[in-house]
Interface confidence: low
């Protein structure tokens, strides 16, 4: 079973998936659609790196631009380094300014 077939089988269960499952899924060439991504638990999405989200969404990663003001994308952006977000070429704004030392990412959630 290839990645896309596997994704179709588990799609309906993904809403409550933990971060570990999403990280594993990102390695399987699943090309998750934006509608599914937007239904994921915010706390599960937040720890994902830019590279992991890029792999998870595949060609659908461009959809992050249209969803940048909505959760969980908005909250995820706030936790990423702007340098890393810039590598996507989508013009996503709101990441941690380049050069800032990140002391406690959980603090950002309280401030946002």
């Amino acid at each position: 079973m290839n990645g896309s077939e596997y994704f179709v089988k588990i799609q309906s269960f993904l809403g409550g998936a933990p971060t570990e499952d999403l990280k594993a899924l990102s390695q399987q060439n699943v090309s998750m659609d934006l509608a599914t991504f937007m239904k994921l638990r915010t706390d599960a999405v937040l720890p994902l790196t830019v590279a992991e989200v890029q792999k998870l969404l595949g060609p659908h990663v461009e959809g992050l631009k249209a969803e940048e003001r909505h959760r969980p994308v908005r909250d995820w952006i706030l936790r990423q380094r702007q340098d890393d977000l810039d590598t996507l070429g989508l013009g996503l704004q709101g990441g941690i300014p380049n050069g800032y030392l990140v002391l406690d990412l959980s603090m950002q959630e309280a401030l946002s």
Epitope: S31, P59, E62
Partner: antibody, heavy 120, light 109 residues
Framework: QLQLQESGPGLVKPSETLSLTCTVS??????????WGWIRQPPGKGLEWIGS???????FYSPSLKSRLNIAVDTSKKQFSLKLSSVTAADTAVYYC????????????WGQGTLVTVSS | EIVMTQSPATLSVSPGERATLSCRAS??????LAWYLQKPGQAPRLLIY???TRATGIPARFSGSGSGTEFTLTISSLQSEDFAVYYC???????????FGQGTKLEIK
């Protein structure tokens, strides 16, 4: 009803810059749901993706053309543009502008195309 | 770059008969494949996307199938307006690097 209309010179000299504009009517160029793209087709040949631009200005280019290419958007004029520098006869083609949903890389609506010939 | 190869280059079929066009990708494109129809002097028109979903206004005689690297466009009963050139296109790459097949010309037998 959405309409895409390409415009620009039909003849460009070798080594010069090819400049085309696509005007969007009957729809919003500022929609967050779409990218706006350029595709070309040399006479009697197949289709080649050139690049795409989002209303924010974020653009993506074909790797083979990237060094010579600039695609920009002017939302106030409801237009997006293509500039291809240092052209040769190999750049002679019908150039199409098209709409692309942000969720995928397909092109769901096309302009009628404009032929650009590179010749001295 | 993902190379898309279409076969045959030309297909001769009689009106009312079934036509089967093939498209092969040099590596997996998942289900991110589209088909377009182009008539002489006209822009391409989107027929199928996501391998098997018909675009708005496309008749049910057009159907798509496949996944990964092998894809098929089937026209169940050819009408006179279906004779044209058909292109497949993959959109499974990031950053975007969309590639088209070289086309299959469907002609009247």
């Amino acid at each position: 009803q959405l309409q895409l209309q390409e415009s620009g010179p039909g003849l460009v000299k070798p080594s010069e810059t090819l400049s085309l504009t696509c005007t969007v009517s009957g729809g919003s160029i500022s929609s967050s749901s779409y990218y706006w793209g350029w595709i070309r087709q040399p006479p009697g040949k197949g289709l080649e993706w050139i690049g795409s631009v989002y209303y924010s200005g974020s653009a993506f280019y074909s790797p083979s053309l990237k060094s010579r290419l600039n695609i920009a958007v002017d939302t106030s004029k409801k237009q997006f543009s293509l500039k291809l520098s240092s052209v040769t006869a190999a750049d002679t083609a019908v150039y199409y502008c098209a709409r692309r949903p942000y969720k995928s890389g397909l092109f769901d609506f096309w302009g009628q195309g404009t032929l650009v010939t590179v010749s001295s | 770059e993902i190379v898309m190869t279409q076969s045959p280059a030309t297909l001769s079929v009689s009106p009312g008969e079934r036509a089967t066009l093939s498209c092969r990708a040099s590596q997996s494109v998942s289900s991110n494949l589209a088909w377009y129809l182009q008539k002489p002097g006209q822009a391409p028109r989107l027929l199928i996307y996501g391998t098997s979903t018909r675009a708005t206004g496309i008749p049910a005689r057009f159907s798509g199938s496949g996944s990964g690297t092998e894809f098929t466009l089937t026209i169940s009963s050819l009408q006179s307006e279906d004779f044209a050139v058909y292109y497949c296109q993959q959109y499974n790459t990031w950053p975007p690097e969309y590639t088209f097949g070289q086309g299959t010309k469907l002609e009247i037998k």
